[in-house]
């Protein structure tokens, strides 16, 4: 097989037709030395999954539901390009399953027993396999037969589809569940009318059925949404309150030496030529021979699915769930409003080392997984690996957009006993520099720079922003001669001056030896110019405070604060001289954890936090010699956030501007996915 | 620095048992936390049991019911009763006392046990 050839899957005779012509006509329009289509012929879907993962194939087209077959080992394939729907300007590639009331009710999703429920038909997703996977463990047992089990869970339900002679409660509500439209509450719009009639008290349809149906906002208005944490929503907040996000059409590949860039380069190709209203002697998105053959004949397109986007987080954690729970059977022995032990994500083995020291004084209410990156244990938290880690306000900000919730905010300046219950202004982040030198923030240009890692808010979103507003432009790699920024580009002169050692050098973890604040300022000590780090990081590595050799001797006079109007202060000035204030680190978790995560903290600290006062024969949560592991060392206590409860309400709407507008530059492949 | 040993490793047949000794060079007395962790072939090193000061224990699931950790203070020696052992059991078993645990990666020799018929 040439290597520039993608061997696309069909499954019926009439897909092969539809292949043949596609290869035809992409061989009429590419070059000869472009991409080229072959095809494969299976007999079904999962045969086409089987077959890529056999290295038979190399693409094709898959449900939601499929997608999560070809993500299963042995087959790991990945999403490489979505079919969008709607506009090109508005490109729609998921839906969302939602749970529609009316807004005179009072329940919420964990009161749906005994309800009347409205569903668009037996195995559809956002109707049955959904809503019926997140309700798997409340349902009552035996679980099997499941149409038995939901029949007992609601009070009546209108299933189409469903068998109504087994199972007559499931077409209570429509008798004899009509498999069509000529059931009335049959499909999305049917079962909203369902809903809209007062058959049923929920309809499990999709975000887009409500608008469909009803043109009138004083109509929607009298409709909400059921959200998973047991609150409600407006229907327009879907995005906020859905039980699950669906994709809507993918197309996979092997995730090692799966072609990517090579389906990419075809279908872009293919898009440009024989899209919607390209041309007339082949469509893309129709065909004479069937409906929706190799793609949906409702697609407008296609998008590239970001690489660091894997079936995992392009499925989501609740869709998972849901299949999961539907397919294997099986739940927690524990009841589910009781809260199992908490799994913090913990970076490489310095942290993985004082988290197993958490997890034994904890009694296992604590247990450890560990990623190589704050990013990969941000991925690890949204897909469930995980439930909860403390982050810089920089990765506060990429968790949030990620879908993680903030919990509580480290306290770094409030005594006991009210520091829980106390909500910080932050701290100040600062430009360091050696009282010798004679730089100032104006001449900082062709300098030796010390970064505590990329995407973090001293080190990186606040200088660099400031700078990019003096500079326009987003090679920050050219203003710096060289640097060591952990996360960069290996062959960026901001791993220049990084320490390693070797495999981990410039890697945003413990492992480099100049990440962190305490890593930068050792870099600035050892070979920097500027040290963009906080404002306590000079008082908390001088004078003796951190006995590592390098810093045992160093004093706090010998150096010097940066000031935006180009003086320079004493590190002991930082409320008049900084860059900006940066809002405090914050444990952050996925929202269906966050309540669990919050009690089970403020119970640990009340043992382990800062009124422990011999770390030497006890373990401290935070305490770990200036390397700040799992939590910044200076932390005083967990505080409550109150109502800054999401990362835009904790971050501030300045700083979150700030990064925005850095996005520009953004080098983050975790934030690229969760932006899709 | 406490220097930790470990001894008392070896071959056993599926269902037998082992008892492995982390003797310490110094006083354990005041340390917070010991541990066992083993490393398989191939595998990261993973945490087996752990004791706090005051002697509560913390095990994986894997080894809960199986394995039990102790620690003798006077005697300043961590211990680890292994029961029932399976073949998944095999591994490199080390222990720690986690006071060097925020400067370097220091693990001793390590003691094996292999678990065949």
């Known amino acids: 097989v040439p290597e520039k050839s993608v061997r696309w899957c069909a499954v019926s005779e009439h897909e092969a037709t539809k292949c043949q012509s596609f290869r035809d006509h992409m061989k009429s329009v590419l070059p000869s030395n472009g991409p080229s289509v072959a095809c494969v012929k299976k007999a079904s879907h999962l045969d086409c999954i089987r077959a890529i993962a056999a290295n038979e194939a190399d693409a094709v087209t898959l449900d939601a539901g499929l997608v999560y077959d070809a993500y299963l080992a042995p087959n790991n394939l990945k999403p490489v390009v979505a079919e969008f729907y709607g506009s090109k300007e508005d490109p729609q590639t998921f839906y969302y399953a939602v749970a529609v009331v009316k807004k005179d009710s009072d329940f919420q999703m964990n009161q749906l027993r005994g309800r009347k429920s409205c569903h668009t038909g037996l195995g559809r997703s956002a109707g049955w396999n959904i809503p019926i996977g997140l309700l798997y463990c409340d349902l009552p047992e035996p679980r099997k037969p499941l149409e038995k089990a939901v029949a007992n869970f609601f009070s009546g339900s209108c299933v189409p589809c469903a068998d109504g002679t087994d199972f007559p409660q499931l077409c209570q509500l429509c008798p004899g569940c009509g498999c069509s439209t000529l059931n009335q509450y049959f499909s999305y719009s049917g079962a909203f009318k369902c809903l809209k009639d007062g058959a049923g008290d929920v309809a499990f349809v999709k975000h887009s059925t409500i608008f469909e149906n009803l043109a009138n906002k004083a109509d929607r208005d009298q409709y909400e949404l059921l959200c998973l944490d047991n609150t409600r929503k407006s229907v327009d907040e879907y995005k906020d309150c859905h039980l699950a996000r669906v994709p809507s059409h993918t197309v996979v590949a092997r995730s090692v030496g799966g072609k990517e860039d090579l389906i990419w380069e075809l279908l872009n190709q293919a898009q440009e030529h024989f899209g919607k209203d390209k041309s007339k002697e082949f469509q893309l998105f129709s065909s004479p021979h069937g409906k929706d053959l190799l793609f949906k004949d409702s697609a407008h397109g296609f998008l590239k699915v970001p690489p660091r986007m894997d079936a995992k987080m392009y499925l989501g954690y609740e869709y998972i769930t849901a299949i999961r729970n539907l397919r294997e059977g099986t739940c927690p022995e524990a009841p589910t409003d009781e809260c199992k032990p908490v799994k913090w994500c913990a970076l490489s083995h310095h942290e993985r080392l004082k988290c197993d020291e958490w997890s034994v004084n904890s009694a296992g209410k604590i247990e450890c997984e560990s990623a190589e990156t704050t990013e990969d244990c941000i991925a690890k938290i949204m897909n469930g690996e995980a439930d909860a880690m403390s982050l810089d306000g920089g990765f506060v900000y990429i968790a949030g957009m990620c879908g993680l919730v903030p919990v509580l905010a480290e306290n770094y300046n409030t005594p006991n006993p009210n520091c829980e219950n106390t909500a910080e202004e932050g701290y100040f982040a600062v430009a360091v520099v050696k009282s010798s030198s004679d730089l100032t923030w104006d001449n900082l240009k062709g300098k030796k720079s010390c970064h505590t890692a990329v995407g973090r808010t001293a080190g990186w979103n606040i200088p660099m922003g400031l700078l990019y507003s003096k500079i326009n432009h987003c090679r920050f790699d050219e203003f710096f001669s060289e640097g060591c920024a952990p996360g960069s580009e290996k062959n960026s002169s901001l791993c220049k001056l990084c320490m390693g050692p070797s495999p981990n050098l410039c890697e945003p973890n413990n492992k480099e030896g100049y990440y962190g604040y305490t890593g930068a300022f050792r870099c600035l000590v050892e070979k920097g110019d500027v040290a963009f780090v906080k404002h306590q990081t000079v008082p908390q590595n001088t004078g003796g405070k951190n006995p590592d050799a390098w810093a045992k001797n160093l004093k706090e006079e010998d150096y010097e604060l940066l000031c935006l109007d180009g003086s320079r202060k004493s590190v002991q000035e930082p409320a008049n001289c900084h860059l900006a204030r940066a809002p405090n680190h914050a444990v952050v978790a996925r929202k269906d954890k966050a309540d669990c995560v919050q009690t089970l903290l403020l119970d640990q600290q009340r043992m382990f936090g800062s009124s422990v006062t011999d770390c030497s024969s006890n373990f401290c949560l935070f305490e770990s010699k200036t390397k700040d592991l799992l939590f910044r060392d200076d932390t005083v206590c967990l505080a409550k956030l109150h109502d800054r409860n999401t990362y835009e309400k904790y971050l501030g709407e300045e700083y979150v501007k700030a990064v925005t507008n850095l996005r520009k530059c953004s080098t983050s492949p975790l934030l690229e996915a969760c932006t899709f | 620095e406490v220097q930790l040993v470990e001894c008392g490793g070896g071959l056993v047949q599926p269902g037998g048992s082992l008892r492995l000794s982390c003797a310490a060079s110094?006083?354990?007395?005041?340390?917070?936390?010991m541990a066992w962790y083993r490393q398989a072939p191939g595998k990261q090193r993973e945490l087996v049991a752990g004791i706090t000061r005051s002697g509560s224990t913390n095990y994986r699931d894997s080894v809960k019911g199986r394995f039990t950790i102790s620690r003798d203070n006077a005697k300043n020696t961590m211990y680890l009763q292994m029961n029932s052992l399976k073949p998944e059991d095999t591994a490199v078993y080390y222990c720690?006392?986690?006071?060097?645990?925020?400067?370097?990666?220091?693990w001793g020799q390590g003691t094996q046990v292999t678990v065949s018929s």
């Open positions: 110094g006083s354990i007395f005041s340390i917070a936390t």
């Open positions: 720690t006392d986690y006071s060097s645990r925020y400067y370097h990666d220091y």
